[in-house]
Interface confidence: low
């Protein structure tokens, strides 16, 4: 029977009694910077080709003998759960390796950073079909690796990372925290996060995705038929590696950001038991275990769009929190989230020629988070339209007004400590869906864009009574793009979305009492592109 | 031939210990999570443990939570229960079952009979 | 922890009749990512260990003869024997596999009337 790793990531359309979804990704190279490898076994003969490239430590220790076949296991399970020809993900894939870590798996930065610059110039020599390159490695936070990868990526790289096994925030490893890399946590069988002796696959918001990596069966180098269990997030990253093979073989002209978003897309959403990562950590943690595409043609048409944490801003008075997109991405909402409910709202604006999400703490906040939702959206034009504090109790309202623009998302932000516990709530006025509205007391940021063939819609969903959590979700074919909570509702924590739902936190229940401003309402903006759906039928 | 060989049943005093063992052939015993399953007498069948592949994960019932242990030796292809602090409810015959690497049991052990007793 | 419930616990059916055992889960074992149902159906006959029959609810496990089948999704499984031959006279257990702890049905007796 299949092993249940290569069964967890195959859609049903594809499954047989052999895992054998369409082209292998053969049109795609896979870098792999490891350990040495055993190139002669079975599993990866003649698929990998071992570089002469070679930056590693001296091993630890008086006593430690090299052993062959110690020496490769590391690297050569990985190859194998890439390409292998029985238990491997891409089966057509080619690889090469190079040789970054040691005999006892450890390496240095400055040798992954060569690694990273050999694998540059070979590729402005002999530009070749899409790269990826698998990074089964974590240490410390560096900032030079980080700006390597950052380097390797806006060069057309696609860099798949371990998340790292120190059952600890990814933000604080490389090249996990590196915003350009794809970085890939561990599930297993059970779709538990994998836990490693005391320690177990990393979390948090510098995580993309997870992938299976417990008791994952590949190519052990004890010899050239051998087959071994491994486990780590370094087997997740092969994974991911491996998909990313599939799709780009499958799509070669897709940009890193494409590629991204559609592996979060075509994930397996919400199965993974979140009570096994430390709570504050589980709102950062994406649930979303990989998967291959159930077609690898045709989604071109959809709006994808996924959610970009920021850092903790920290809790000074003035303090603030900024998520960003990446460079082929589009901005086209900002919501911000305070665990004690103490923030001033976040606002869209402009840095370096881009738009940002830039979130506010409160005094007696212990800091907030920006939550930037970032899409795809070829042809678009954004920009953000304020309207200031309104003088009318009304409240503050503000709406696309230009030609062919639609309302994305909205924001609001407040100079006031304690907005909304002197005001009464502000009702938007029915029949007006296409406007942001705010207190009078703060200022309303509309996102406002214009792209071929793109609609949107509001939904909203209220609850009279107090609840600690009320979401509203768009429907199918629709993708969410913009989540906020209407006014009025003093206990707001804050919004963001998850995946294609809008979830607005408040206050426990039990500290706020029902009042008349226990009502709380999620906004959720729903959008779709035309055009993009015209498109890819034409390329049909 | 593939096959699971269990020993080390008996009879045991409440508050006693015995470990039993269930030596695997026939399969790639690294690969594979195992588990082990009881009957009481007359009764159905009930879960106690499951141990991974590679020995990093292990699961209880609540029922022996504390007081089993699950184990493999990867170099002898066997897997064991230490079994402590033994109570009269966990006489039954104890079966070593080898998972799928899902959760279901496609090789059983013929099982062997622990009975609490003073 | 999720209940498993057999119906009924004991079934006496006339040989190359069909016997038809039902077992329902206190939630859904269907696994949104691959669409299977984590739920097995074991054979136990008098003196041996169980066997595995079915899995992911309906597939056969290799040997098994094609006169057992297994179907249903979400809560609601039935295994049916086409028709009972005298070998199959054993007790069935249904098992979901979804999640820890494994949980298996009280048990079903099969007879031949």
């Known amino acids: 029977s299949i092993p249940w790793n290569l069964e967890r990531i195959t859609p049903p359309r594809y499954r047989a009694d052999e895992y054998q979804p369409p082209d292998g990704g053969s049109l795609v190279e896979v870098y792999l910077l490891d350990t040495s490898i055993q190139s002669d076994h079975r599993e990866i003969e003649g698929r990998v080709m071992v570089t002469d490239f070679e930056n590693v430590p001296e091993e630890d220790g008086t006593r430690f003998h090299r052993q062959a076949s110690k020496c490769d296991s590391h690297g050569t399970h990985l190859a194998g759960v890439v390409s292998g020809r029985d238990a491997g993900v891409a089966k057509g894939a080619s690889m090469r390796s190079l040789r970054v870590l040691n005999c006892q798996g450890k390496g240095t930065v400055s040798g992954t950073l060569i690694g990273l610059e050999f694998i540059r110039k070979s590729q402005l020599v002999q530009p070749v079909g899409p790269l990826v390159v698998l990074l089964p490695l974590a240490g410390g936070y560096s900032r030079v690796l980080n700006a390597a990868c950052q380097r390797l990526a806006r060069a057309g790289v696609v860099l798949v990372t371990a998340a790292g096994n120190f059952r600890d925030d990814a933000c604080l490893y490389s090249p996990a925290s590196a915003p350009e890399v794809i970085t890939v946590g561990a599930t297993n069988a059970q779709d538990q996060p994998v836990t490693l002796g005391t320690l177990g696959t990393n979390f948090g918001r510098c995580v993309d995705l997870f992938a299976p990596g417990e008791d994952i069966i590949g190519a052990s180098s004890d010899c050239s038929t051998c087959f071994v269990s491994q486990s780590g997030t370094s087997q997740a990253a092969a994974h991911v590696a491996g998909i990313a093979a599939m799709m780009l073989s499958a799509e070669p002209e897709l940009t890193l950001a494409e590629l991204r978003q559609r592996l979060i897309h075509f994930s397996a959403k919400d199965v993974i038991n979140e009570a096994w990562f430390p709570e504050d950590q589980r709102v950062l943690t994406p649930n979303l275990v990989a998967a291959l595409p159930p077609s690898t043609h045709g989604a071109g048409w959809q709006l994808f769009c996924r959610t970009v944490w920021s850092a903790h801003s920290g809790p000074t008075r003035m303090a603030t929190a900024v998520a960003r997109c990446a460079p082929d991405e589009e901005l086209l909402s900002c919501s911000s989230f305070s665990r004690s409910g103490k923030r001033r709202g976040e606002r869209m604006e402009a840095q370096g020629g881009k738009l940002v999400c830039r979130a506010h703490n409160a005094f007696g906040g212990e800091g907030v988070y920006a939550i930037a939702r970032c899409c795809l959206l070829p042809q678009a034009n954004c920009s953000v339209h304020t309207a200031p504090p309104a003088e009318a109790s009304m409240g503050t309202r503000v709406h696309c007004h230009q030609q062919g623009h639609v309302l994305t998302g909205c924001s609001s932000h407040w100079e006031v400590e304690d907005l909304g516990t002197h005001k009464p709530p502000v009702l938007r006025p029915r029949g007006q869906p296409n406007q942001c509205v705010g207190h009078r007391e703060a200022s309303i940021h509309a996102s406002c864009c214009h792209a071929p063939g793109l609609e949107c819609k509001v939904k909203e969903h209220g609850i009279p009574a107090p609840q600690e959590q009320v979401t509203v979700a768009c429907e199918e074919g629709w993708t969410l793009t913009g989540c906020s909570a209407l006014p009025g509702t003093s206990h707001v924590l804050g919004a963001y979305a998850v995946d294609n739902t809008c979830v607005v936190r408040s206050r426990d229940v039990s500290t706020t009492g029902s009042t008349s401003e226990g009502a709380v309402t999620a906004v959720a903006i729903c959008c779709r592109s035309r055009h993009l759906a015209q498109a890819s039928q034409e390329l049909q | 031939e593939v096959q699971l060989v269990q020993s080390g049943g008996g009879l045991v005093q409440p508050g006693g210990s015995l470990r039993l063992s269930c030596a695997a052939s026939?399969?790639?015993?690294?690969?594979?999570?195992m588990n082990w399953v009881r009957q009481a007498p007359g009764k159905g069948l009930d879960w106690v443990s499951t141990i991974s592949g590679s020995g990093g994960t292990t699961n209880y019932a609540d029922s022996v939570k504390g007081r089993f242990i699950i184990s493999r030796d990867s170099s002898k292809h066997t897997l064991y229960l230490q079994m402590n602090s033994l109570r009269a409810e966990d006489t039954a015959v104890y079966y070593c079952a080898k998972d799928s690497n899902w959760g279901n049991f496609d090789l059983w052990g013929r099982g062997t009979t622990v009975t609490v007793s003073s | 922890d999720i209940q498993m419930t057999q119906s009924p616990d004991s079934l006496a059916v006339s040989l190359g009749e069909r016997a038809t055992i039902n077992c329902k889960s206190s939630q859904s074992v269907l696994y949104r990512s691959n669409n299977r149902n984590f739920l097995g159906w074991y054979q136990q006959k008098p003196g041996q260990p169980p066997n595995l029959l079915i899995y992911?609810?309906?597939t056969r496990e290799s040997g098994v003869p094609d006169r057992f089948s297994g179907s249903g999704s979400g809560t609601d499984f039935t295994l049916t024997i086409s028709s009972l031959q005298a070998e199959d006279v054993a007790v069935y257990y249904c098992q979901q596999y979804y999640t820890t702890p494994y949980t298996f049905g009280q048990g079903t007796k099969v007879e031949i009337k």
């Open positions: 026939g399969f790639t015993f690294n690969n594979y999570a």
């Open positions: 992911w609810a309906s």
